[in-house]
């Protein structure tokens, strides 16, 4: 076709190819790129960056080829907009750095940079990683170090060639609801470039006021909740090398409640319960106002809990097999250092067979049972019976 | 499936202590008590105690308060047994054993054989 | 604590006879009773529980029955199996007990 002629060829159904020496100095704007999954770039010494919008409106490209151009300047940010790109070659062109963020987050198969001269230094410390433990097909010729010609240096050697270190340090003290918390991040490391707190758990949970830059960064959680319990508080720093983050969590001590449900027959019989406070309050069963010692046959269980962000823990006092000997007044404590609380609930799981009308004859097979066990049984169940 | 792993035998001198193992596997290991049984040879069953590998609570038969101890560590997900001050009198075979779907010991160990000998 | 008293200690028969094994209970323990068979130098294998439900893959010719103090385990047609040692136990709380066993013994 007679397009073909001036810059770029259609290759196929959605393939792209620029080999037309010296025809291109930018990809943006390339026409009919929307549903583009391939793009050959070949002589292009014009082609010098590549930048953050440059391949916009490429959402579909998987392999991506530049080769034998002029290109000396990858963007960090130039894949954004091709999250699917998993083929990338950059060989023969005058690169001599690439950034591990370039490439960060896409699912590269294989990736090529042969023919650059990448120069040894920490930037490339990932790319050196990469090769080392096969993490995706990488080709590259040795690193050029500052002296003569081609040499390996052995980056991960040089105690200066790391990611940043990352220390967030939080108070002694026990925290209380309505204080002010004061956090400090301490990065150290080579060439860093930038720090901040990740707070998206955080909201709701207290006031937040940002100070401070690098190398320490202060976070002042202002008048903190309950809720800030079992959320992370995160502090990432990035330089050449990479990036670290470090999280910790804020515990916020206030008093333990409780409370109950109605007994439930399920494969054996639950009482519910939902117990809150932090620290994470001992809990204590009473029957019948009396200390009721567990055993197999009732017992404590906690439910599995998919969410790991919240101090209530939810359970059952389990019974396996009761029958009228355990009914009645079941009570729960539970207390921590802050407060206790304790909530009450009847049970009745059968009827005593021993309340007769004296008209009735008397259950000759029946003895009697001692009324004040807490540790007999219960009801059939369909599931395996801890 | 549910499998109750214990070695075979121990031959441990009178005035000794023993541990037993039961390593656990094919089920959730904190969700059930484990029990422990006593057979004499040639004798019948009888029951030690039980433990909760959840939180370690742990009752025992009065006959055996003051001969063995019930312990869990459940990273191995292991029970154990510890019997103290050994008599020949403790010479048996020792079970771990979980209830199934009912209350009823539907998993046993192969059982440990415990000799006091001089 | 609850004993579990069982006869007889022990039994002769032949294989296709039809034996049963009791189990009185020194209180009333409802249906809370499980059978267990157990071979020379074996673990015990639970057959019953809940006094007459059978466990998973136990033949149909076991079967238990009773409630309350009385208990029993019927074996109909003995096979050469079936030959070994028996034991109740109640489940009604702890602590558990056992029945002293009964040895069932080819004739």
């Known amino acids: 076709a007679a397009s073909c002629r001036e810059t770029c060829c259609p290759v196929g159904p959605s393939g792209l190819r620029c080999t037309r020496a010296g025809t291109l100095n930018t990809l943006r704007g390339l026409r009919g790129a929307g549903n583009l999954t391939e793009l050959y770039v070949e002589n292009q010494r014009d082609l010098q960056r590549l930048e953050f919008e440059d391949l916009q409106g490429l959402g579909e490209l998987r392999s991506l080829t530049i080769v034998k151009s002029g290109l000396r300047f990858v963007a960090p940010d130039a894949f954004h907009f091709t999250p699917r790109l998993s083929h990338l070659n950059l060989s023969s062109n005058a690169l001599e750095s690439l950034s591990w963020k370039t490439v960060q987050g896409l699912s590269l198969q294989d990736l090529t940079l042969s023919g650059n001269p990448l120069h040894c230094s920490c930037a490339l410390l990932w790319l050196q990683r990469w090769e080392q433990e096969d993490l995706c097909g990488v080709y590259t010729q040795k690193l050029q170090g500052s002296g003569s010609g081609d040499q390996f240096l052995p980056l991960g050697h040089n105690n200066s060639c790391g990611v940043p270190s990352v220390k967030i340090q939080m108070p002694n003290d026990s925290v209380e609801v309505g204080d002010d918390v004061f956090l400090q991040c301490q990065v150290e490391g080579q060439a860093l470039q930038q720090a901040d707190w990740i707070l998206t758990e955080l909201e709701g949970t207290a006031t937040m006021k940002k100070s401070g830059d690098l190398p320490s960064l202060g976070l002042t959680l202002v008048n903190v909740t309950s809720d800030l319990n079992k959320k992370n508080v995160t502090c990432w720093a990035e330089n050449d090398v990479g990036r670290a983050e470090v999280s910790v969590q804020v515990s916020v001590s206030f008093p333990a409640s409780v409370h109950l449900g109605k007994a439930v027959e399920q494969h054996h019989w639950c009482i519910p319960f939902s117990v809150d406070g932090q620290p994470a309050p001992s809990l204590r069963w009473f029957f019948n106002g009396s200390v009721l010692n567990e055993t197999s046959f009732i017992f404590t269980q906690f439910l599995e809990s998919a969410l790991t962000n919240e101090t209530m823990r939810h359970g059952c006092l389990r019974l396996n097999q009761p029958t009228h000997v355990n009914n009645g007044n079941y009570t729960l404590l539970a207390a921590n250092p802050y407060g206790q609380a304790a909530a009450s609930i009847m049970a009745a799981f059968m009827d005593n067979p021993f309340e007769f009308n004296p008209e009735d004859p008397i259950p000759v097979s029946f003895s009697p049972v001692d009324t004040n066990s807490t540790s007999r049984d219960p009801v059939e169940k369909k599931d395996e019976t801890p | 499936q549910v499998q109750l792993q214990q070695p075979g035998a121990e031959l441990v001198k009178p005035g000794a202590s023993v541990k037993l193992s039961c390593k656990a596997s094919?089920?959730?290991?904190?969700?059930?008590?484990m029990h422990w049984v006593k057979q004499r040879p040639g004798q019948g069953l009888e029951w030690i105690g039980e433990?909760?590998?959840?939180?370690?609570?742990?009752n025992y038969d009065e006959k055996f308060k003051t001969k063995a101890t019930l312990t869990i560590d459940k990273s191995s997900r292991t029970a154990y047994i510890q019997l103290s001050s050994l008599t020949s009198e403790d010479s048996a075979v020792y079970y771990c054993?979980?209830?199934?779907?009912?209350?009823?010991?539907?998993?046993w160990g192969q059982g440990t054989l415990v000799t006091v000998s001089a | 604590d609850i004993q579990m008293t069982q006869s007889p200690a022990s039994l002769s028969a032949t294989v296709g006879e039809t034996v049963t094994i009791t189990c009185r209970a020194s209180?009333?323990?409802?249906?809370?009773v499980a059978w267990y068979q157990q071979k020379q130098g074996k673990s015990p294998q639970l057959l019953v529980h809940?006094?007459?439900t059978l466990a998973e893959g136990v033949p149909s010719r076991f079967s238990g029955s009773g409630s309350g103090t009385q208990f029993s385990l019927k074996i109909n047609g003995l096979h050469p199996e079936d030959f070994g040692s028996y034991y109740c136990?109640?489940?009604?709380?702890?602590?558990?007990?056992f029945g002293a066993g009964t040895k069932l013994e080819l004739k």
């Open positions: 054993a979980k209830y199934g779907n009912y209350v009823a010991f539907a998993f």
């Open positions: 094919g089920y959730t290991f904190t969700s059930y008590w």
């Open positions: 433990i909760n590998p959840n939180n370690g609570l742990t």
């Open positions: 209180e009333n323990i409802y249906s809370y």
């Open positions: 809940n006094a007459k």
């Open positions: 136990q109640h489940h009604y709380g702890i602590p558990l007990t």
